[in-house]
């Protein structure tokens, strides 16, 4: 049977041989592999200006394997695709394209943004923060005694940092004035230890200066988000005032 295949091909290609290298079923000196052994994939390999047929157990990058009855071949991925699973599903795009649902796009669709590291279209992630922690004890110059008017602080954590197009994070620290019944400091009492919760260090990229306090200090360039945050903070303070009217600590 092989001899007959060789005989038939010999008319077309001089030097056809069944004694082929690397998985060829039939081959020629000029063309390399003409056909492959079962389960191997045929691919044209460019060597300078020449194309040589080779048989591989899996397809090279930029190709995917197509299997038909008794004939397998490596088929090129689409022009904008570097690695693909099949004709319609890319897994890595060429430079300058973004991967989205197996397709390579110039720009990401609305509602998604380009991740320039993975070169994929990803969901826009908005900032997420936790609920406020309780207010700290009323302090003045680090003491919890020997004064009537001081400040108290509360913090919240960033649960999810925003992506490039996501909404910015609101402030994570709030400070307000507080009034307490003056209490004499005991000898050697600084009033800090064991009474004040350790304050969380500001998150990377956050500065202490950016922490708004109840005086409502504004930065010279205020974004719409910051303006909205301040309005929300004011609302919260009014609510807190109403809730705390029973307690000793009051907001000025």
């Amino acid at each position: 049977q092989n001899a007959s295949r060789g005989r038939r091909q010999r008319r077309m290609h001089p030097n056809v041989s069944q004694g082929c290298q690397g998985g060829c079923a039939t081959c020629s000196d000029y063309n390399g592999c003409l056909s492959c052994k079962p389960r191997l994939f045929f691919v044209l390999e460019r060597i300078g200006m020449k194309q040589i047929g080779v048989c591989l157990s899996s397809c090279p990058s930029g190709y995917y394997g197509t299997r038909y009855p008794d004939i397998n071949k490596c088929t090129k991925c689409k022009a904008d695709c570097d690695t693909c699973f099949n004709k319609n599903f890319c897994t890595k795009c060429k430079s300058g394209f973004y991967l989205h649902l197996g397709k390579c796009l110039d720009n990401c669709p609305e509602g998604l943004e380009a991740n320039n590291h993975t070169m994929e279209c990803v969901n826009i992630v908005h900032c997420e923060v936790s609920e406020w922690n309780p207010w700290s004890p009323c302090t003045k110059k680090g003491k919890t005694c020997g004064f009537k008017r001081g400040t108290e602080t509360r913090v919240r954590e960033i649960m999810q940092h925003p992506s490039a197009k996501g909404n910015l994070c609101p402030p994570t620290n709030e400070t307000r004035k507080c009034t307490v019944q003056r209490k004499k400091c005991q000898k050697g009492e600084r009033g800090k230890k064991g009474r004040e919760r350790k304050r969380k260090k500001p998150n990377k990229g956050e500065s202490k200066e950016a922490i708004p306090d109840s005086k409502g200090l504004e930065s010279s360039k205020e974004t719409p988000e910051q303006r909205e945050n301040k309005q929300q903070q004011k609302k919260r303070k009014v609510q807190d005032k109403q809730q705390k009217s029973v307690s000793v600590s009051t907001v000025h």
Epitope: Q9, S28, S35, K78
Partner: antibody, heavy 119, light 107 residues
Amino acid sequence: EVQLQESGPSLVKPSQTLSLTCSVTGDSITSGYWSWIRKFPGNKLEFMGYISFSGKTYYIPSLKSRVSITRDTSKNQYYLQLNSVTTEDTATYYCATYHGYGGPWFAYWGQGTLVTVSS
Amino acid sequence: DIKMTQSPSSMYASLGERVTITCKASQDIDSYLSWFQQKPGKSPKTLIYLTNRLIDGVPSRFSGSGSGQDYSLTINSLEYEDMGIYYCLQYDEFPVTFGAGTRLEIK
């Protein structure tokens, strides 16, 4: 020299089955891929499918439900059956062969047989 | 299916003239393209395969070129026996598909 020769009825009635034989000499149908191709009036060529050296078949999606390619290795022949024919199946039917992606496709053809579908 | 758009659909050319027939695939076919010639009452005859490889016995005035989606067949100096219908075929992907043909006639 590889030769392919089609044979079968030249007239088939609508709704009936078209049956053709391709007789091969100079090569064995247990190597390579053995195809059927048809040429419609107006010169459009259509590949219909193939049977491989091991007897596996491939049919084009548009004909899959009504086409069958079989073979008889002892006679070195392969066959085409096309069911439920209509006048749209009137064409010249060719058998042809190829031996893989690195060689010429359809290097050898039969001379063709004209099949008319008419009542 | 991959669509092969062949042009022109028909043409007249003079003996000795250089003739070019083109085929455009609906997607990249990676050089898996053949050209056939069919004369009246005869079966198609393979001229070229894998874009530019000439079949043994085909005159050297025939040549093929192209890549990606665009391919062409050139007859360098037309002879009388070259008249007929020329078809391109893509076999990059099943089902393999033919162009609609170019009828070449002598002026």
